[in-house]
Interface confidence: low
């Protein structure tokens, strides 16, 4: 007789989740010599231990601590790029500007990027049918708690000038409910971080407005200033040209504003 299984509102665990995590770990540790000491089987065991046999609406940051410890990594604290609602461009940028890092350029972020996972209370099974949705079901689900934990730690790690890429095409360029707005902004350490510099990425070809004057950017500035961190903002009017100029800064067309 098939067991009754909780139906959640979100998609289920990504197909071949254990194999994907393990394969990503092996690939990452091969590419990054400083992480060659990492035992990927132990990483998977710690990852699994965070959510297997636990109610998927009752996950805590403590559940992920063994994984956090195993995934400890050295990233230059003054080379951190945060992003909100514009992941692809942020990742394209760090692929070119190799000395800057998004969370997904770290081992833990790389392992979990674009994956979904959850288990079931009191069974060792992974739930491939459905997982809790953050809004419709619960916020303390395995995926949300994971990203909250690693995002908090990543923000805590930052120092000097921290950059954030924001999507200028959205109605809320800065969204207080995003991971950046709800976690990262509040965990930058004022004694270490001098400035948060926002890069507002324009979508339209003919859009020459100063999106740094947008009310939500002013709201971000206010939050940051109250935390004794300086704020600066730049419009990236042509993201395609921006990336091109990061690749080839000597190009004569790159001396004008991008």
């Amino acid at each position: 007789v098939p067991r009754w299984r909780q139906q959640w509102s979100g998609p289920g665990t990504t197909k071949r989740f254990p194999e994907t995590v393990l394969a990503r770990c092996v690939k990452y540790t091969e590419i990054h010599p400083e992480m060659r000491h990492v035992d990927c089987q132990s990483v998977w065991d710690a990852f699994k231990g965070a959510f297997i046999s636990k109610h998927p609406c009752n996950i805590t940051e403590e559940d992920y601590q063994p994984l956090m410890k195993l995934g400890t990594q050295t990233v230059p604290c003054n080379k951190i790029l945060l992003w909100s609602r514009i992941k692809d461009l942020a990742h394209q940028f760090t692929q070119v500007q190799r000395d800057m890092f998004t969370l997904e350029d770290t081992l833990l972020g790389y392992l979990a990027d674009d994956l979904t996972w959850c288990g079931e209370f009191n069974t060792s099974k992974i739930n491939y049918q459905s997982c809790p949705d953050w809004r419709k079901d619960c916020s303390n689900n395995p995926v949300s708690v994971f990203w909250k934990t690693v995002s908090r730690r990543f923000a805590e790690a930052a120092c000097d000038v921290v950059h954030v890429m924001l999507n200028g095409s959205r109605s809320k360029i800065f969204d207080k409910n995003s991971t950046f707005g709800s976690v990262e902004v509040h965990n930058l350490q004022p004694e270490k971080v001098q400035t948060l510099e926002a890069w507002v990425i324009h979508g339209g070809r003919e859009d020459s407005r100063d999106l740094c004057q947008d009310p939500t950017i002013k709201e971000l500035e206010s939050i940051i200033s109250k935390r004794n961190i300086q704020f600066s903002c730049k419009n990236i009017y042509r993201p395609d040209k921006f990336l091109q100029c990061v690749k080839n800064p000597e190009d004569s067309s790159c001396t004008s504003e991008i």
């Epitope: 400890t72 050295t74 230059p76 604290c77 730690r153 990543f154 270490k192």
Partner: antibody, heavy 123, light 107 residues
């Protein structure tokens, strides 16, 4: 303002060990890295290793691997550097220094230094 | 490990003059370079980090430049308290390494 206060000068016999302490006062300790650097008389500066207390994670320069142990006690905000199998060439001033270290990254530049501890190795 | 080479070993300068110290890395260290000043009997003092950013409380006469493998520390107008030994240090790759130092002495 954070200050790093080191233990006093030591005179040691060859083959013995020395343990130098470095206490942080006036600020947080755990969220930083503590690095150890030595300077032989009339010579330049040489990295030995570093620890991030919150992780209890130490890294050592190859030259000192196996001979140096760096530890930290968060409850007393004190870091320790123990060097074993001492020889006359280990006669030097040993400095601890604070770097910005936290979870994901290694410390980098060092903004606050202890006053130094002279260790003399002589038979 | 990355070898840091400083030149000259000794620089003789008169007070009020400009001093230019060089530091070369055996491979690229990006901008992950710091400069320290050390006076006899004292611990090193951080002057510059990130190759060009002055540390808190450091006078504007100290400036750093360069990236990759070639770096320069410039003291625009030497004061009596600036006569000391200066070290560069890379923190791009572990083990971090110092240059052998440049002694700035009174001419």
């Amino acid at each position: 303002q954070v200050q790093l206060v080191q233990s006093g000068a030591e005179v040691k016999k060859p083959g013995s060990s020395v343990k130098v302490s470095c206490k942080a006062s006036g600020g947080s300790f755990s969220n930083y890295a503590i690095g150890w650097v030595r300077q032989a008389p009339g010579q330049g500066l040489e990295w030995m290793g570093r620890i991030i207390p919150v992780l209890d994670a130490a890294h050592y320069a190859q030259k000192f691997q196996g001979r140096v142990t760096i530890t930290a006690d968060e409850s007393t905000s004190t870091a320790y550097m123990e060097l074993s199998s001492l020889r006359s060439e280990d006669t030097a001033v040993y400095y601890c220094a604070r770097g910005l270290g936290y979870y994901l990254y290694s410390s980098y530049y060092f903004d606050i230094w202890g006053q130094g501890t002279l260790v003399t190795v002589s038979s | 490990e990355i070898v840091m080479t400083q030149s000259p070993a000794t620089l003789s300068v008169s007070p009020g003059e400009r001093a230019t110290l060089s530091c070369r890395a055996s491979q690229s260290v990006s901008s992950n370079l710091a400069w320290y000043q050390q006076k006899p009997g004292q611990a090193p003092r951080l002057l510059i980090y990130g190759a060009s950013t002055r540390a808190t409380g450091i006078p504007a006469r100290f400036s750093g430049s360069g990236s990759g493998t070639e770096f320069t520390l410039t003291i625009s107008s030497l004061q009596s308290e600036d006569f000391a030994v200066y070290y560069c240090q890379q923190y791009n790759n572990w083990p971090w390494t110092f240059g052998q130092g440049t002694k700035v002495e009174i001419k």
